[in-house]
């Protein structure tokens, strides 16, 4: 089971939507559904995501990047990994940087994994810059 | 197939050159050739790279870090992963930070993987700080 | 062999201590002992760590994040991966960011792996923000 999803510039809402077919994207043994990766087989997975944030005029608004898990058995989302950026650039100038997350988790069949970010308009969705993936160990 | 290449302070040009033998470096089932990792066996690979940038006096020049793929069948390089940093430090002071990239790609026998960066003089090549690797899933 | 250890807010000293049981933490085929992961079986491992730094008033004190290895056969610790941050925020304001490290290493039975950081008081130990793990390839 493996997936590498790449940035989709048509993302209009949270959680982020992804490209699962073209370019460097690939998916096998898991399903892609409405922004989420759906686990088919219970086991240990390495999960990763990178988001490339940039803006024309820095005002240091908080940047959040989360990978979270949802399962119909549990009422609340479980945040697996997250990053927050505060006070990262000089006001008034263009700015750019990425957030990277990656770790091992025990996932169960039917778990849905998503990526949440704080500001859609600040993301560059090029496939090499923003992505989300996993593979079964 | 696995490799972990470490920073080579004798790098004089782009793409970066690497240490493949001493210290924590290791290589097996792939070849190292003129800065590149050459894939022997088609399949899925997790590819990663970290670059440690630092400078004596910040002027916020753009920092680029790319992992790209070259194959004789294709005329152009394919950028697999990249990071750009702009507006990341207070002008005139010493500064330091790293860029980390890592993801899964479907690679083909004879693909060459390289790391490109924007400013050789701003890299610290210590083996624990700057590296490039992959392993076959 | 696999482990994912999460932030332990009761860490009072260096190396960092971790949670190995509750929440998203997991461990199998390696041992957790006084902040360290103890390798049972010689082989290749992907090792990773993320540390989330934050502070109430930026003074740009250096931030270090290291993954190092200790073995009774060697007198000195071996730093496998490290990150240093200097000049990363505007003085006097709240700030936050993470450091991520991950790479492949050839580890030997009885090797101990630890995480070292520069300033305990600047870390947020939530399980999704600060973690340390590995898995055998």
């Amino acid at each position: 089971s493996v997936a590498h999803l790449t940035g989709n510039p048509h993302s209009r809402s949270i959680p982020l939507e992804w490209e699962d077919t073209y370019g460097t994207a690939l998916i096998s043994g898991v399903k892609y559904k409405k922004g989420g990766l759906v686990i088919n087989e219970t086991g240990l997975y390495f999960v990763y995501s990178k988001v490339y944030f940039r803006g024309q005029s820095c005002n240091n608004q908080p940047l959040n990047h989360k990978v979270y898990m949802r399962n119909s058995k549990y009422p609340e989302d479980l945040v697996l990994m997250e990053e927050k950026r505060l006070n990262y650039c000089t006001t008034g100038q263009i700015w750019a940087h990425s957030s990277y997350l990656g770790a091992v988790f025990n996932l169960t069949s039917a778990d849905h994994l998503y990526v949440n970010i704080s500001q859609l308009s600040l993301i560059n969705f090029e496939e090499s810059k923003t992505f989300f993936g996993l593979y079964k160990l | 197939s696995v490799a972990h290449l470490t920073g080579n302070p004798h790098s004089r040009s782009i793409p970066l050159e690497w240490e493949d033998t001493y210290g924590t470096a290791l290589i097996s089932g792939v070849k190292y050739k003129k800065g590149g990792l050459v894939i022997n066996e088609t399949g899925l690979y997790f590819v990663y790279s970290k670059v440690y940038f630092r400078g004596q006096s910040c002027n916020n020049q753009p920092l680029n870090h790319k992992v790209y793929m070259r194959n004789s069948k294709y005329p152009e390089d394919l950028v697999l992963m990249e990071e750009k940093r702009l507006n990341y430090c207070t002008t005139g002071q010493i500064w330091a930070h790293s860029s980390y990239l890592g993801a899964v790609f479907n690679l083909t026998s004879a693909d060459h993987l390289y790391v490109n960066i924007s400013q050789l003089s701003l890299i610290n090549f210590e083996e624990s700080k700057t590296f490039f690797g992959l392993y076959k899933l | 062999s696999v482990a994912h250890l999460t932030g332990n807010p009761h860490s009072r000293s260096i190396p960092l201590e971790w949670e190995d049981t509750y929440g998203t933490a997991l461990i199998s085929g390696v041992k957790y002992k006084k902040g360290g992961l103890v390798i049972n079986e010689t082989g290749l491992y992907f090792v990773y760590s993320k540390v989330y730094f934050r502070g109430q008033s930026c003074n740009n004190q250096p931030l270090n994040h290291k993954v190092y290895m200790r073995n009774s056969k060697y007198p000195e610790d071996l730093v496998l991966m490290e990150e240093k941050r200097l000049n990363y925020c505007t003085t006097g304001q709240i700030w936050a960011h993470s450091s991520y490290l991950g790479a492949v290493f050839n580890l030997t039975s009885a090797d101990h792996l630890y995480v070292n950081i520069s300033q305990l008081s600047l870390i947020n130990f939530e399980e999704s923000k600060t973690f340390f793990g590995l898995y055998k390839l």
Partner: antibody
């Protein structure tokens, strides 16, 4: 010396398209962000769009988003503005302007090119 | 969006006068403000950045001050070449210009 020269303006009907160009000389074009700023007849200045030094990122004013596309060819030292679905309110003199070291202010401006959208 | 309001809209003055143009921001923009001069049929000319830093080559009779929401452009002794329209521009959050102040001969 730094020079920016716009061209491509003219009279066009509503709903039609036009492409403006801005030829740059006297500086290293590929290291500067370049903006388009417009000025309706007898009115003030309005920022339109920007493209980063390497062309990697572009930003637009809400009034033109989805209709205008900024691009550049660093090998030709040229900036472009593709204007589609033009409206009467797009009538203006269009200036290209160089930003100062990644700051959003403009140290050099072209002489402008007039775009008139009229039926 | 941050709105920039200049006052007065028109200012009549004579050669040798000291004149002040005010620019107000709808919210704090720290010192991230630039000033430009524009003459009829010409492109704007860059004068001041970061509220008070004079661009190289701009005569020292021009000065800027202010921070937060209130800013001023002062010309200490008007010269014939100074009669023009002046614009402020904030770059704290994207880019917006004031509506302009026309400085005319009294």
């Amino acid at each position: 010396q730094v020079q920016l020269v716009e061209s491509g303006g003219g009279v066009v009907q509503p709903g039609r398209s036009l492409r403006l160009s801005c030829a740059a000389s006297g500086f290293t074009f590929s290291t500067y962000g370049i903006h388009w700023v417009r000025q309706a007849p007898g009115k003030g200045l309005e920022w339109v769009a920007v493209i980063w030094y390497d062309g990697s990122d572009k930003f637009y004013a809400d009034s033109v988003k989805g209709r205008f596309t900024i691009s550049r060819d660093n090998s030709k030292n040229t900036l472009y503005l593709q204007m589609n679905s033009l409206r009467a309110e797009d009538t203006a003199v269009y200036y290209c302007a160089r930003d100062r070291d990644n700051w959003n202010y403009f140290d050099y401006w072209g002489q402008g090119t007039l775009v008139t959208v009229s039926s | 969006d941050i709105q920039m309001t200049q006052s007065p809209s028109t200012l009549s003055a004579s050669v040798g006068d000291r004149v002040t143009i005010t620019c107000r921001a709808s919210q704090s923009i720290s010192s991230w403000l630039a000033w430009y001069q524009q003459k009829p049929g010409k492109a704007p000319k860059f004068l001041i950045y970061q509220a008070s830093s004079l661009e190289s080559g701009v005569p020292s009779r021009f000065s800027g001050s202010g921070s937060g929401t209130e800013f001023t452009l002062t010309i200490s002794s008007l010269q014939p070449d100074d009669f023009a329209t002046y614009y402020c521009q904030q770059y704290n959050s994207y880019i917006t210009f004031g509506q302009g102040t026309r400085l005319e001969i009294k």
